[in-house]
Structures are given as C-alpha cells and as structure tokens.
C-alpha cells in the first residue's frame, strides 16, 4: 500500500544535518521502519516483542536513530548537494495484525544555508 506524500513536516534541518521524521500510528506495537533514498535502503529500525512482552530494538543498517511512541527519526549529517533526493519511510506493521506496509515520502531540497561547511 502506497500512501504517497507525508502529510507532516518530514525534514527538520539543524547544524548542517537533517532529521528525517517517519511517523506511525500510536496503535502500532511492533514494526519495521526503513528509510529509503530513492530505492536504496539507508537505515532501518525494527521493534518487536517476545513471548514475555520483552521489547527488542534492532538496526540492520546502522544510522543514528531515535524512537518515540509514534515516530522514528533518522539523522543524516554533513549534508551536501548529493543528499538531495526523494526519501521514503517504508513502514511494515507486524502488530496489530493484519500485516501491512505503507510508504510515505517527500523530496529533500538542499539549499546553501543548510550545508554544514559553506564556502565563503
């Protein structure tokens, strides 16, 4: 299932880097969130629970990430013009069932003012 464009501010710039916000519904308890740049998986984070309700968080592709109760933030640093691209949050929902996949995204524009080390 493709949801299309994110209906929230997906990119937050600070200190020459960008926080990419990937939201998910509050009701979701177990999931995998992947950050895609074009068709390439840049980052992922999986939250699951075991049979005794113990929570496991794992990242196969390491990125600086931050988990809250309704979003995963991925952080990209040292921005340059090559970072300009379409970025997608690919959410796989395991729990609650049924299994569902949603894709939301937007274009990351890079402006001179957002680069970490501007040439003077």
């Amino acid at each position: 299932e493709i949801n299309g464009s994110a209906n929230y501010e997906m990119f937050i710039f600070h200190n020459g880097g960008v926080q990419i916000l990937c939201k998910y519904p509050d009701i979701v308890q177990q999931f995998k969130m992947q950050l895609l740049k074009g068709g390439q998986i840049l980052c992922d984070l999986t939250k699951t629970k075991g049979s005794g309700n113990t929570v496991s968080i794992k990242s196969l592709k390491f990125c600086h990430s931050q988990l809250s109760n309704n979003s995963v933030s991925f952080f990209l640093y040292n921005l340059d013009h090559s970072h300009a691209n379409y970025y997608f949050c690919n959410l796989s929902i395991f729990d609650p069932p049924p299994f569902k996949v949603t894709l939301t995204g937007g274009y990351l524009h890079i402006y001179e003012s957002q680069l970490c080390c501007q040439l003077k």
């Epitope: 177990q30 075991g50 005794g52 794992k58």
Partner: antibody, heavy 117, light 111 residues
Framework: EVQLVESGGGLVQPGGSLRLSCAAS????????MDWVRQAPGKGLEWVSN????????NFAPSVKGRFTISRDNAKNSLYLQMNSVRAEDTAVYYC??????????WGQGTLVTVSS | DIVMTQSPDSLAVSAGERVTINCKSS??????????LIWYQQKPGQPPKLLIF???TRQTGVPDRFSGSGSGTDFTLTISSLQAEDVAVYYC?????????FGQGTKLEIK
C-alpha cells in the same frame, strides 16, 4: 511453508547434559523471536526460554534458570537449547516454537528428553 | 508470575452442542486496549495449534465455530457446534509479562 524440526533428545542421566537443536525453514529466521516450550508426559505446556532476533535478549523460566542456555545461529537457521545439570522433572517433549509477534504460530513436532538413571 | 487457571479440567459434550471453556488470570492481561491472551488446541500426539490471539482474534484458517471473548482477568473459548475433530486439549496462555504461562489445560471429549 514454515517448518521447525527438533533433534537431540534422548536418555540422559540426572546431572548430565544434552543439547537440543531446531532447524527452521520456510521463513526468514532472523526476523523472529524463538522459544522452547516443554510438555511432561501426560501434563500441560510449560514455557522454557526465548531469544530475540540476534541473541541479545534471552529469558528463562525460573525452573531452568542457571542450568539451561539458549542460543541461535541465524546463518544456519538454527535454534539450540543446552541443558546442563538435568533433573528427573526435566523429562518432557521439548518443542521449538516461533513467536509470530503475538502468539506461537508455528511449532515443531517435538523431541523427547528422558532423564533417568 | 501470572497464574492461569482453566475450568473445567475436562468435559464431555455431544456433537453439535455448544462448548464453553473458561480461563482466569491472577492479574489483568489488558494493556493498551489489548488483552494478551491466547488459545491453543492440542490433539493427541501433535504439537499445539494456534486458535485465538488477543483474546478474540481468530487465527487464519481456524473455523468460525471457534470464538474467544473476555477482558481483564476472565476469558472464554466457545465452540458453537462441537464437531468430532474438535476432541483435544485446549490451553490458554498469557504474554503480558515474562514468564509467559499456560493454563493447565481442558480436555474436551465427545459424549
């Protein structure tokens, strides 16, 4: 089709050791928590242990803690239960089970462990 | 540890009749709007089979004569019209916390 096949059961003396194995196929093994559940002859089900995707988190039933260890090899799609210092009350069929996020949705046929002198 | 208690321990019911099996937990299994309660069926010589999860959600492929209900500490598995192939032992299980524990089982036979 999901398949779980246990092996390694048999007769073992009290105080002895045994290693059970579970070969998994038909699914992406590393995506799932895995568990061991046992059933004494003519009795009910008892959870034994579980392990998360990459072996970072493990839990044990109080009855086996300190004696049993659980491990997995994702490259071999295999789950293991190392049983040390076994007792008569460990006699049971041991099932390997996949935790499908909200229930045990797949089980092996089980392997019988008999502790007797 | 949470203690799961099933009742009755066994029962014999005529084919076509309604069957009710109860499961009581020693503390509430309700969290975030979900009851962390599962039902399994185990036939002789076989491993358990998942029937119901989250107290009332039927697993794919399970006949609709099986249903689950209840919330908090009291749960029920109902078979609306007993069939010969339903002869088995039924177990409830919680996954609210570690360790997950099972009820002692209810043996169902045909009268």
């Amino acid at each position: 089709e999901v398949q779980l096949v246990e092996s390694g059961g048999g007769l073992v003396q009290p105080g002895g050791s045994l290693r059970l194995s579970c070969a998994a196929s038909g699914f992406t093994f590393s995506d799932y928590w895995m568990d061991w559940v046992r059933q004494a002859p003519g009795k009910g089900l008892e959870w034994v242990s579980n392990i998360d995707h990459d072996g970072n988190i493990i839990n044990f039933a109080p009855s086996v803690k300190g004696r049993f260890t659980i491990s997995r090899d994702n490259a071999k799609n295999s789950l293991y239960l190392q049983m040390n210092s076994v007792r008569a009350e460990d006699t049971a069929v041991y099932y390997c089970a996949r935790w499908g996020h909200y229930a045990f949705d797949s089980w092996g046929q089980g392997t019988l462990v008999t502790v007797s002198s | 540890d949470i203690v799961m208690t099933q009742s009755p321990d066994s029962l014999a019911v005529s084919a076509g009749e309604r069957v009710t099996i109860n499961c009581k937990s020693s503390q509430s299994l309700l969290s975030s709007g979900y009851n962390y309660l599962i039902w399994y069926q185990q036939k002789p010589g076989q491993p358990p089979k998942l029937l119901i999860f989250y107290a009332s959600t039927r697993q794919t492929g399970v006949p609709d004569r099986f249903s689950g209900s209840g919330s908090g500490t009291d749960f029920t598995l109902t078979i609306s019209s007993l069939q010969a192939e339903d002869v088995a032992v039924y177990y409830c299980q919680h996954h609210y916390s570690s360790p997950p524990t099972f009820g002692q089982g209810t043996k169902l036979e045909i009268k």
